[in-house]
């Protein structure tokens, strides 16, 4: 009776289980009743992760550094290489084929999470009593200054992409 | 045996250009990815360049990029690194070391040539 | 980039003795995708050109001695010589093969006491 199912790393061909290509192998003939899958490795800059019945291995991918990419894992046989952005730019998709300047955060606004290679900057309105009155892509809201803790007053109100301003007391004399 | 030898080092003035060639043998050439490698006079190993066996996939070190340019003709069986706009500090031996598709490390270097930068 | 410290910078010992050096890098060389550590050694002997020694972190390249040994992941790794021979003699560079730019420790240089 021929197998309708076969084990785990083999696969069915012609009634017959054949054992798959290890990761970093392509297939180059299925078994017979008297041989064994013929495997081949893969050539240099080309892989397969995966246990398989390929005839062809994929080709590594390129960081291009004209797209400011950069590897972040050297390919292998078994493993594809791994991009990521330089610094200051992050991803535009998951799979990291071209890179775009980090965005900045404009005055009112703060980082609230710093971007990555794979991640942009994430800015937040700078809440009452915090000001920001720069754009840029690391720094977060700072607080307003506290004149009582200088012996001063407020002379004039902060705003949100300003700071409070300071003077002396008016004292009675 | 599998053999690299390379040539074209010498004395260049600052600013000026070189080409350098890798003669490769005892091995099919075009299943290879290459590398230039340099080692400064009593100093470490600094990687140059990458090239992978079918031409796709070229990689420099930042010291390098926009000046040498890694190249390769697997009719000829030849590796070649044209360096531009030298400087003293490029002064080293050249190796040229091949990368196979299993390993994926150098696993053959050739002698190396002596490249000198100086007025 | 990756940077790959060794230590010592040299060290001489005896014959049949045996050596030890150390080699750690900046960041893991651990591939996430076959969990192999890409972590290479080479010899080079006095005039000539670098060798590989070691790939993989601990597999030895054909033809090299089994008295040549490496251990380690992650960031820590180390390459010992069980009984130094004087064709030992030479500088032994640790090498991150994990991603570009390749990069190389300052070298070891074992020599005999």
């Known amino acids: 009776e021929p197998p309708t199912a076969c084990r785990e790393k083999q696969y069915l061909i012609n009634s017959q289980c054949c054992s798959l290509c290890q990761p970093g192998q392509k297939l180059v003939s299925d078994c017979t009743e008297f041989t064994e899958t013929e495997c081949l490795p893969c050539g240099e800059s080309e892989f397969l992760d995966t246990w398989n019945r390929e005839t062809h291995c994929h080709q590594h991918k390129y960081c291009d550094p004209n797209l400011g990419l950069r590897v972040q894992q050297k390919g292998t046989s078994e493993t594809d290489t791994i991009c990521t952005c330089e610094e200051g730019w992050h991803c535009t998709s998951e799979a990291c084929e071209s890179c775009v300047l980090h965005r900045s955060c404009s005055p009112g606004f703060g980082v609230k999470q710093i971007a990555t290679g794979v991640s942009d900057t994430i800015c937040e309105p700078c809440p009452v009593g915090f000001f920001s009155n720069v754009s840029s892509a690391f720094e977060k809201c700072h607080p307003w200054t506290s004149c009582e803790t200088k012996d001063l007053v407020v002379q004039q109100a902060g705003t949100n992409k300003t700071d409070v301003v300071c003077g002396p007391q008016d004292r009675l004399r | 045996e599998v053999q690299l030898v390379e040539s074209g080092g010498g004395l260049v003035k600052p600013g000026g250009s070189r080409r350098l060639s890798c003669a490769a043998s005892?091995?099919?050439?075009?299943?290879?990815?290459m590398h230039w490698v340099r080692q400064a006079p009593g100093k470490g190993l600094e990687w140059v360049a990458y090239?992978?066996?079918?031409?796709?996939?070229?990689y420099y070190a930042d010291t390098v990029k926009g000046r040498f340019t890694i190249s390769r003709d697997n009719a000829k069986n030849s590796l070649y690194l044209q360096m531009n706009s030298l400087r003293a500090e490029d002064t080293a031996v050249y190796y040229c070391?091949?990368?196979?598709?299993?390993?994926?490390?150098?696993?053959?270097w050739g002698q190396g040539t002596l490249v000198t930068v100086s007025s | 980039d990756i940077v790959m410290t060794q230590s010592p910078d040299s060290l001489a010992v005896s014959l049949g003795e045996r050596v030890t050096m150390s080699c750690k890098s900046s960041?893991?060389?651990?591939?996430?995708?076959?969990?192999?550590?890409?972590l290479t050694w080479h010899q080079q002997k006095p005039g000539q050109p670098p060798k590989l020694l070691i790939y993989?972190?601990?597999t030895r390249e054909s033809g090299v001695p089994d008295r040549f040994s490496g251990s380690g992941s992650g960031t820590d790794f180390t390459l010992t010589i069980s009984s130094l021979q004087a064709e030992d003699v030479a500088v032994y560079y640790c090498?991150?093969?994990?991603?570009?730019?390749?990069?190389f420790g300052g070298g070891t240089k074992v020599e005999i006491k």
């Open positions: 070391a091949r990368q196979d598709g299993y390993r994926y490390a150098m696993d053959y």
């Open positions: 005892g091995f099919t050439f075009s299943d290879y990815g």
């Open positions: 090239i992978s066996s079918g031409n796709r996939i070229i």
């Open positions: 960041q893991s060389l651990l591939n996430s995708g076959n969990q192999k550590n890409y």
């Open positions: 993989w972190t601990s």
């Open positions: 090498q991150n093969d994990y991603t570009y730019p390749l990069t």
